[in-house]
Amino acid sequence: MMCLECASAAAGGAEEEEADAERRRRRRGAQRGAGGSGCCGARGAGGAGVSAAGDEVQTLSGSVRRAPTGPPGTPGTPGCAATAKGPGAQQPKPASLGRGRGAAAAILSLGNVLNYLDRYTVAGVLLDIQQHFGVKDRGAGLLQSVFICSFMVAAPIFGYLGDRFNRKVILSCGIFFWSAVTFSSSFIPQQYFWLLVLSRGLVGIGEASYSTIAPTIIGDLFTKNTRTLMLSVFYFAIPLGSGLGYITGSSVKQAAGDWHWALRVSPVLGMITGTLILILVPATKRGHADQLGDQLKARTSWLRDMKALIRNRSYVFSSLATSAVSFATGALGMWIPLYLHRAQVVQKTAETCNSPPCGAKDSLIFGAITCFTGFLGVVTGAGATRWCRLKTQRADPLVCAVGMLGSAIFICLIFVAAKSSIVGAYICIFVGETLLFSNWAITADILMYVVIPTRRATAVALQSFTSHLLGDAGSPYLIGFISDLIRQSTKDSPLWEFLSLGYALMLCPFVVVLGGMFFLATALFFVSDRARAEQQVNQLAMPPASVKV
């Protein structure tokens, strides 16, 4: 077995990878020249295709290996891994996709921007929605809960579908679906609050299809450092879309003089993007970048896939670590603006807020910081990983672990600084969030390394489900509950309002440290799990009879 990790480190950058691909393409071209109409051409025409003994299979990490050869003309014979569909048909090799792959990744990333833009446009006009529908805080909580719950429930379903059916069609349908629902929701009459709740649930389902399947297409279009880069771009869409959502919500509302129009922007863009996905995203086969072409379709049951994922220790630990990130971001996003407002009340630089929105200025600053640190975190994480891959085989999980543990320190310092300096608190938030967000793209990349292509959508879905369930679905409520519990046992004062929330939020750095530990655990099993995935991919490239996953 070739040292897969070293292969990763050896190819220092995307440029080398493209050069590798070019060399492979030339070699394949020479073989095709000798063999007439391509490696599968003879069999496609009805004859027996003879496979060259030197055919290559590109692995999950992008390394090239000699493939075992089967009997001539056997489906699944390397060199004929992309089973011909008709006389002389050939499957395009990933290298031949060229600029199209970049365009596809760009469109998928744009779709992700829109996913989050849509989600946070609603957040940007939430006060107006509450005012218009007469929604109480528990009603606003219901809107959030319904969205997250429907997203969580739908994610595994789309994971299953994404591993078995045409992914770009599912993606486009998902975008068209949530676009139509969001657009329709802008016309819901005041008395039908329940329709608004239902619409958020349906949008959650539509967006789950995208979040689950899109990363797996990128995973199948690219390998190694290029994949890390493309996933970084894809995941940068989260802070970018979120920030743009807030901006879109408030600016469109002001321009049109009616908040309803804010909900009509992302659906129009969504319809355009959905169409572009259908046109520009290639119908990439699972494991395409791994040179496994059409051979890879999930032949295992969903239950078997789940069992395999649960036994995959790198996957389990990285998913638990992702849940820790989700827990912290959910809780901090909900409570930090109010906490900082209370800090200012204690410092006598602001008055006690009697009518909401409380800490509106802090929300705006926090939103801007989150947007920028999201970008900075993704870039820093990807860069650090790329550099560390030259030094160690376990670079990915180790960079994540260091980021998490570093983040925990700065999140702790927020509560120290807030007592005396709001600026100091914001600096700690900035550094803490940058470190926290540095693992977004890397976590996705870890998943791509340790999970075989036919299970990736399911894996992304299960990870998404877990991170919401153990993370942001409950953390805002838990922090609020702990804060109230502390306040009940203390005297009613602005100081204790501030301190109780601060003590409750101290749970976040502990959870983040726990997440760091999970990433360290991932590092322990990463090399072996990655090697196992490589082995399974090679088995998948063999005749179906010999596949045992």
Partner: antibody
Framework: EVQLVETGGGLVQPGSSLKLSCATS????????MSWVRQAPGKGLEWVAL??????????NYAESVKGRFTISRDDSKRRVYLQMFTLRDQDTATYYC????????????????WGHGVMVTVSS | DIVLTQSPATLSVTPGESVSLSCRAS??????IHWYQQKSNGSPRLLIK???QSISGIPSRFSGSGSGTDFTLRINRVESEDFSVYYC?????????FGSGTRLEIK
């Protein structure tokens, strides 16, 4: 049976203050949004102020004509809603009605489903 | 602020006739309109909510319609106790506003 009973009205001079009170019964007061609506003699209805429930952080909203001069408040334990009026003007002379908004637990309506009998406030020198 | 214009200001009818009262909004307000009846020296009471939804305890001869900017309250076969002032109210946006009212009187 739902009952809303206003008290505290009377004759006052311009620039002075007055506090109206509304006692309630027959519904879950703590979850219900409450408003004051007034009607000048021989004129139409005018909404004055609204106070939301605890789950809406007791947010208060006011008509532009009374903003900064009137304060609406509530006491859930006493099931009462109040309208504190400062710097009263001649044009504040009206019958003041205490009203409730229909509640749906997760959200509330903005229409007025129950009305008190009203209390007369006369501002005159 | 959303301005509601009611017409006519006064409507004279004989008992047994059917009448339509109009309320026009200064901008589109979907179906966020409500109708109240105020008898002389009495408090207003809710007749119709959200343009067309009936209220329990209110006679079925009262019905509402409309959406956007134009709304109508219809009284089928007016009875003697229906002679009062009718107000429309919008809840589309704050501040909550009322129409100037339509007085229904005996011809």
């Amino acid at each position: 049976e739902v009952q809303l009973v206003e008290t505290g009205g009377g004759l006052v001079q311009p620039g002075s203050s007055l506090k109206l009170s509304c006692a309630t019964s027959g519904f879950t007061f703590s979850d219900t949004w409450m408003s004051w609506v007034r009607q000048a003699p021989g004129k139409g209805l005018e909404w004055v102020a609204l106070i939301k429930d605890k789950n809406s952080n007791y947010e208060a909203n006011y008509a532009e004509s009374v903003k900064g001069r009137f304060t609406i408040s509530r006491d859930d334990s006493k099931r009462r809603v109040y309208l504190q009026m400062f710097t009263l003007r001649d044009q504040d002379t009206a019958t003041y009605y205490c009203t409730s908004h229909e509640d749906f637990y997760y959200y509330s309506s903005y229409y007025f489903d129950y009305w008190g009998h009203g209390v007369m406030v006369t501002v005159s020198s | 602020d959303i301005v509601l214009t009611q017409s006519p200001a006064t409507l004279s009818v004989t008992p047994g006739e059917s009448v339509s009262l109009s309320c026009r909004a200064s901008q589109g307000i979907s179906t966020s309109i409500h109708w109240y009846q105020q008898k002389s020296n009495g408090s207003p009471r809710l007749l119709i909510k959200y343009a067309s939804q009936s209220i329990s305890g209110i006679p079925s001869r009262f019905s509402g319609s409309g959406s956007g900017t134009d709304f109508t309250l219809r009284i089928n076969r007016v009875e003697s106790e229906d002679f009062s002032v009718y107000y429309c109210q919008q809840t589309y946006s704050l501040p909550l506003t009322f129409g100037s009212g339509t007085r229904l009187e005996i011809k």
